[in-house]
Interface confidence: medium
């Protein structure tokens, strides 16, 4: 074979967002018949020559960027895309509220606001069932996520996390769930308001295939991202390369 071997995939199961003291498994997947895997934590000297790393209890020190590669004969593969393992529950949960309220008429506007304390200048807003979070571009201790022209599809359970751009892999606990109810529509919402919100441990299904991809710079546009946009779109003039999250392999 000419050229380097194709890169493997690296996944965190059940999620790359891991509550402190909870288990997570990092799995490197290459083609059949691999001679040797190497899984490493970047910016550290930690590595192991195995395809699977089981972490029985997540610690702050284990949060960070990981990648893997494999060897066949004397050839090494290209490295996998980086997987960024985030420890959650490190800091107090932010508060999540809806303005003017959590019940909104179809076609109306609502703003979800996540608020925390000084020094936590980054936010991620998750809607259960969506494959990626929404990011607020502006660094501040509260973040606004406007939803313009609400539809039934916006109904559901939302949570937000806060973290510091100084320690981007150490996140807060999730906010209490906020149930957004869209009235005046016959379409079934994605989650019934009477149904109890799922516990944090089960919430990971929405993020099971996320690879967190941070940069040191936040989006420079001051306009908050409307969460009617597709999660795969970039709201940055620099394009998708500066998105914070990309779908895992």
């Amino acid at each position: 074979q000419s050229g380097p071997l194709p890169k493997p995939s690296l996944q965190a199961l059940p999620s790359s967002l891991v509550p402190l003291e909870k288990p997570v498994t990092l799995r490197c997947q290459g083609p059949p018949g691999v001679d040797l895997y190497r899984l490493e934590k970047l910016s550290s000297s930690r590595y192991q020559d195995q395809a699977v790393l089981f972490i029985p209890a997540m610690k702050r020190s284990l949060a960070g960027r990981y990648r893997c590669s494999y060897q066949n004969g004397s050839l090494w593969s290209l490295p996998s895309d980086q997987l960024e393992l985030v420890a959650t529950g490190v800091f107090a949960k932010p508060s999540l509220s809806a303005q003017p309220g959590p019940a909104v008429s179809s076609g109306g506007d609502v703003t979800l606001q996540c608020q925390t304390r000084y020094g936590f200048d980054q936010f991620a807003l998750y809607k259960e069932g969506d494959p990626a979070p929404y990011k607020n571009p502006e660094r501040w201790y509260r973040a606004s996520f406007p939803i313009i022209t609400v539809t039934a599809a916006h109904s559901g359970t939302y949570r937000c996390y806060s973290f510091s751009s100084r320690d981007p892999y150490l996140w807060s606990a999730p906010s209490d769930p906020l149930e957004l109810v869209v009235t005046g529509t016959s379409v079934t919402p994605s989650r019934l308001p009477t149904e109890p919100p799922s516990p944090v441990a089960e919430f990971s299904e929405a993020t099971a295939e996320l690879t967190v991809s941070f940069t040191n710079e936040v989006f420079t546009t001051e306009t908050s991202r409307s969460i009617t946009a597709s999660p795969k779109e970039s709201d940055s003039p620099a394009g998708p390369a500066r998105q914070y999250y990309t779908k895992g392999n």
């Epitope: 000084y118 020094g119 660094r139 807060s172």
Partner: antibody
Framework: VMLVESGGGLVKPGGSLKLSCAAS????????MSWVRQTPEKRLEWVAT????????YYPDSVKGRFTISRDNAKNTLYLQMSSLRSADTAMYYC?????????WGQGTTLTVSS | DIVLTQSPASLAVSLGQRATISCRAS??????????MHWYQQKPGQPPKLLFY???NLESGIPARFSGSGSRTDFTLTINPVETDDVATYYC?????????FGGGTKLEIK
């Protein structure tokens, strides 16, 4: 990282003044910024904060309604407009990059309020 | 407002010895087990310089002779061993509660 303050001077009580802070060496538009002052007695006091894009501002009660923080990200410049100045506002004024704590500070510019 | 009281106000230490500076908060600055207390060094004619953030996280480029510890209301900055270059005033600052406040400073001198 470099932060360079300017605009300080001698002002009479009740007067106004605008301070500037020119930033370089980092992506200015990505960071919340603050003004912190140091009195002649060497006490430090946080004065104002503005979010990275300029949408949000925050002040302690001691300057609220009298001071206005703003920024021009195209010019990489932070401002502090001060009015209704009092002798208690006499201080060295520093601009600083803000994480809740302040990881980079300018050299400061001096404001003296005196009749 | 949270009041931060530093002690002593001034401190004279022999070269090579240990310097210990205390900062006491009028109420807890902890949240979720994290202490929102920070330390700065200010040399004459210079702006403050960040030493530690969140009580014990050493800022990049600061020598390991400096250590930060404490939780809730009681925090300590330790320099061991003290060197000539450490002559400065040291300040603590909290960011757990608005408004953010600073301690009154501790002036370190060489004996």
């Amino acid at each position: 990282v470099m932060l360079v303050e300017s605009g300080g001077g001698l002002v009479k009580p009740g007067g106004s003044l605008k301070l500037s802070c020119a930033a370089s060496g980092f992506t200015f538009s990505s960071y919340a910024m603050s003004w912190v002052r140091q009195t002649p007695e060497k006490r430090l006091e946080w004065v104002a904060t503005i979010s990275s894009g300029g949408s949000y501002t925050y002040y302690p009660d001691s300057v609220k309604g009298r001071f206005t923080i703003s920024r021009d990200n195209a010019k990489n410049t932070l401002y502090l407009q001060m009015s209704s100045l009092r002798s208690a506002d006499t201080a060295m004024y520093y601009c600083a990059r803000d994480y809740g704590y302040f990881d980079y500070w300018g050299q400061g510019t001096t404001l003296t309020v005196s009749s | 407002d949270i009041v931060l009281t530093q002690s002593p106000a001034s401190l004279a230490v022999s070269l090579g010895q240990r310097a210990t500076i205390s900062c006491r908060a009028s109420e807890s600055v902890d949240n979720y087990g994290i202490s929102f207390m920070h330390w700065y060094q200010q040399k004459p004619g210079q702006p403050p310089k960040l030493l530690f953030y969140r009580a014990s996280n050493l800022e990049s480029g600061i020598p390991a002779r400096f250590s930060g510890s404490g939780s809730r209301t009681d925090f300590t900055l330790t320099i061991n061993p003290v060197e000539t270059d450490d002559v400065a005033t040291y300040y603590c600052q909290q960011s757990n509660t608005d408004p953010r406040t600073f301690g009154g400073g501790t002036k370190l001198e060489i004996k």
